[in-house]
């Protein structure tokens, strides 16, 4: 007689390991005999997917290699046409041994910031974290936390929480430790011991002491009067993360020294900085081998004309050169209003560079005179008239005073560029700039009284200032 | 044209002494710096002294106080004075204008020191 | 005192070849106020003196071939020979301007094939 399916056997919660293998049973008593259908979380498991075998008549559902993903409802559903169908479930719990998805890596971090050691698990039962640093289970303390997802976040990082870090997950099913990583602590440089500031005689050695220390271990570099050190010997020594440097210097001259501690977190850098002074005593004696000394422009008037952070010449010749060589060039500067618009400029330029000489680095301290060729331009080119009412002047003893002839060259007493393109000071302002031709002045010029060569042409821009010469 | 020639070089015994001169033309000699450089036989070059348009002489630590720059503005000559010869001061000797760069050199004298 | 290291110690090459001479200072040789470099390259050939094809670096003296260029600041410098030519068989010198005394470097000698 024809009977509806009944299930004799209904599904059970099975628990299954990753690639184990997972039955299903599904005993159905009927006639005629049942189609059985099989459905994970109600979606239809095809028969012909091969990760499954189905047998007997479909009573027997296998998952032959569990993943973590088979995790859900499974149900089996009889029909034979006599009656309704019916319908068992039951659930498949993917047991997991733990599995470190996301391991924690090497982090560099800056002593006072947050650390965060990524640890991300898998597993079933869900795993507990717990981290190793050294050969040692991690404490936990106000700084250092483990956070529910197994990461370890440190507070306020200090140098002692440098070290080895691994984290461990553990279930009821077994262990998973994470590779070794290293936590370095970086720590911006700091000064530890300042250069202190001198009073020396002229021609004494001076040796300034500078100490720093940081997580690199910080360079130290010195600086003089805004520029690199250019002379003196610099001895460094490093012990425990501490930078020793001494810098002996052969003082001819005033200066600000800076000890420049700098280390690398990254692409940035940390910097401290700390300075001395170091005075000449009886520094108005004369010294023959000593006629100035070099620093930095600290002037006005010639601010517009001179390079930014010119290293000028400043000679000792007068009591207070800064204030004497200013006093100069405003007195002059002054006179100059009155000129033609194609002579100031060409003036001041010629003035402030006469004043203020650039400093020259090789033997200390040395001014370098403005070059022949730009001091004629100047007197036969941009302001010959000028020039000529000026020496008229002179030549008739109208000027009261001697000061404003310290401030104009004699163009014939500088070196000229062709014979030592080092040996003097170019005028920038002077230079003919081929991208803007207005700049070029007028030809108002005879041949110079002095005789000067001509000069062959350049790579650089050039500016024929007369036929018998020119400005590279 | 700037003409720099060297003379005075010879034979000179250890511990001796040597007086080189550099007669300039062509340039207004009292404006610039002047050099002396040294070549040994199949040796590089050798920066051995300078002096400013002030007559401020500097030396190579190896000829410090054993040589001696001078200039005669008027004459338009640059010497060099050796003195305590050594035969590792053999060598060509150069005289140089230049002030950061050695612009132009002589032909150079040979100097050398043997017994 | 500023020690001046060339490398290589020689280079042989074709005519039309590239050369390439770099000079490594002990120190800065760069002036931080201008940010001009105290660096010179000097050519000298078999028996004759040596003359200066580069100064500040960079600047080609003048009557100096354009195959002749210089490059670089601080410590690390270049001389590049463009297109070398049989009369470039010479040994080549860096020399530092910077800081009394003076320093060359030991020399680049350059031979054509």
């Known amino acids: 007689l024809p009977k509806a399916p009944v299930i004799t056997t209904p599904l059970e919660t099975v628990d299954a390991l990753v690639e184990e293998v997972a039955t299903f049973m599904c005993a159905v008593e009927s006639y005629p005999q049942p189609e059985i259908s099989w459905t994970r979380n109600k979606i239809l498991i095809k028969l012909f997917d091969t990760r499954y075998s189905i047998r007997e008549n479909g009573q027997l559902l296998t998952i032959l290699s569990v993943e973590d993903s088979d995790d859900g409802i499974y149900c089996c559903t009889a029909n034979n046409g006599v009656g309704g169908a019916v319908e068992s479930c039951g659930a498949l719990q993917v047991k997991m041994k733990p599995k470190i998805t996301r391991p924690p890596i090497n982090v560099k971090i800056i002593e006072g910031l947050k650390a965060v050691l990524p640890c991300t698990t898998m597993g079933n039962p869900k795993p507990s974290v717990s981290w190793i640093k050294g050969d040692s289970p991690l404490r936990e303390n106000s700084r250092t936390a483990v956070l529910e997802s197994g990461s370890l976040r440190i507070h306020n990082v200090q140098k002692e929480d440098a070290g080895q870090y691994r984290c461990v997950a553990k279930n009821s099913l077994g262990t998973a430790y994470s590779k070794v990583v290293k936590l370095e602590v970086e720590v911006f440089a700091r000064i530890l011991r300042a250069p202190e500031s001198h009073n020396v005689t002229f021609g004494s050695f001076v040796t300034l002491h500078c100490t720093a220390t940081g997580i690199p271990v910080p360079t130290i570099t010195w600086i003089e009067n805004g520029n690199a050190v250019s002379s003196g010997s610099i001895q460094e020594s490093v012990k425990d993360r501490v930078i020793d440097s001494r810098l002996q210097l052969f003082i001819t001259k005033p200066g600000l020294y800076t000890c420049i501690a700098t280390n690398k977190h990254g692409e940035k850098f940390s910097t401290a900085k700390a300075a001395a002074t170091v005075s000449i005593a009886e520094w108005s004696k004369p010294q023959k081998d000593n006629k100035g000394y070099c620093a930095q422009y600290r002037g006005e008037v010639c601010n517009a004309v001179l390079a930014k952070d010119a290293l000028v010449f400043l000679n000792t010749s007068y009591a207070d050169p800064e204030e004497a060589q200013e006093l100069l060039v405003h007195t002059a500067w002054n006179e100059l209003k009155v000129v033609s618009p194609l002579c100031r400029p060409a003036a001041e330029a010629l003035l402030c560079n006469h004043v203020f000489q650039e400093c020259s680095p090789g033997v200390v301290p040395t001014p370098i005179p403005i070059c022949r060729e730009y001091c004629l331009a100047v007197k036969e080119l941009f302001c010959a008239k000028e020039w000529l009412a000026m020496e008229e002047k002179t030549h008739r003893g109208l000027y009261r005073s001697e000061m404003h002839l310290l401030s104009v060259p004699e163009c014939s007493k500088l070196p000229s560029m062709h014979w030592d393109p080092t040996a003097c000071a170019r005028l920038p302002h002077l230079d003919y700039n081929k991208e803007n031709p207005k700049t070029f002045p007028p030809m108002t010029s005879s041949k110079p009284s002095v005789d000067i060569p001509n000069l062959p042409s350049s790579s650089s821009s050039s500016f024929s200032v007369s036929p018998t010469y020119s400005m590279t | 044209e700037v003409q720099l020639v060297e003379s005075g070089g010879g034979l000179v015994q250890p511990g001796g002494s040597l007086s080189l001169s550099c007669v300039a033309s062509g340039f207004t000699f009292s404006l610039y710096y002047m050099n002396w450089v040294r070549q040994a036989p199949g040796k590089g070059l050798e920066w051995l002294s300078v002096i400013d348009t002030h007559s401020i002489a500097y030396y190579a630590d190896s000829v410090k106080g054993r040589f001696t720059i001078s200039r005669d503005n008027v004459k338009n000559t640059l010497y060099l004075q050796l003195n305590n010869l050594k035969p590792e001061d053999t060598a060509l000797y150069y005289c140089?204008?230049?002030?950061?760069?050695?612009?132009?050199w002589g032909q150079g004298t040979q100097v050398t020191v043997s017994s | 005192e500023i020690v001046l290291t060339q490398s290589p110690n020689s280079v042989t090459a074709s005519v039309g070849e590239k050369v390439t001479i770099n000079c490594k200072s002990s120190?800065?040789?760069?002036?931080?106020?201008?940010?001009?470099?105290?660096l010179n390259w000097y050519q000298q050939r078999p028996g004759q003196s040596p003359r200066l094809l580069i100064y500040?670096?960079?600047t080609q003296q003048s009557g100096i071939p354009d195959r002749f260029s210089g490059s670089g600041s601080a410590t690390d410098f270049t001389l590049t020979i463009n297109s070398v030519q049989p009369e470039d068989a010479a040994v080549y010198y860096c020399?530092?301007?910077?800081?009394?005394?003076?320093?060359f470097g030991q020399g680049t000698k350059v031979e054509l094939k």
């Open positions: 020399q530092q301007g910077y800081s009394a005394p003076f320093t």
């Open positions: 120190q800065r040789v760069q002036l931080g106020s201008n940010q001009k470099s105290y």
């Open positions: 140089v204008l230049g002030r950061t760069a050695l612009v132009r």
């Open positions: 500040y670096a960079s």
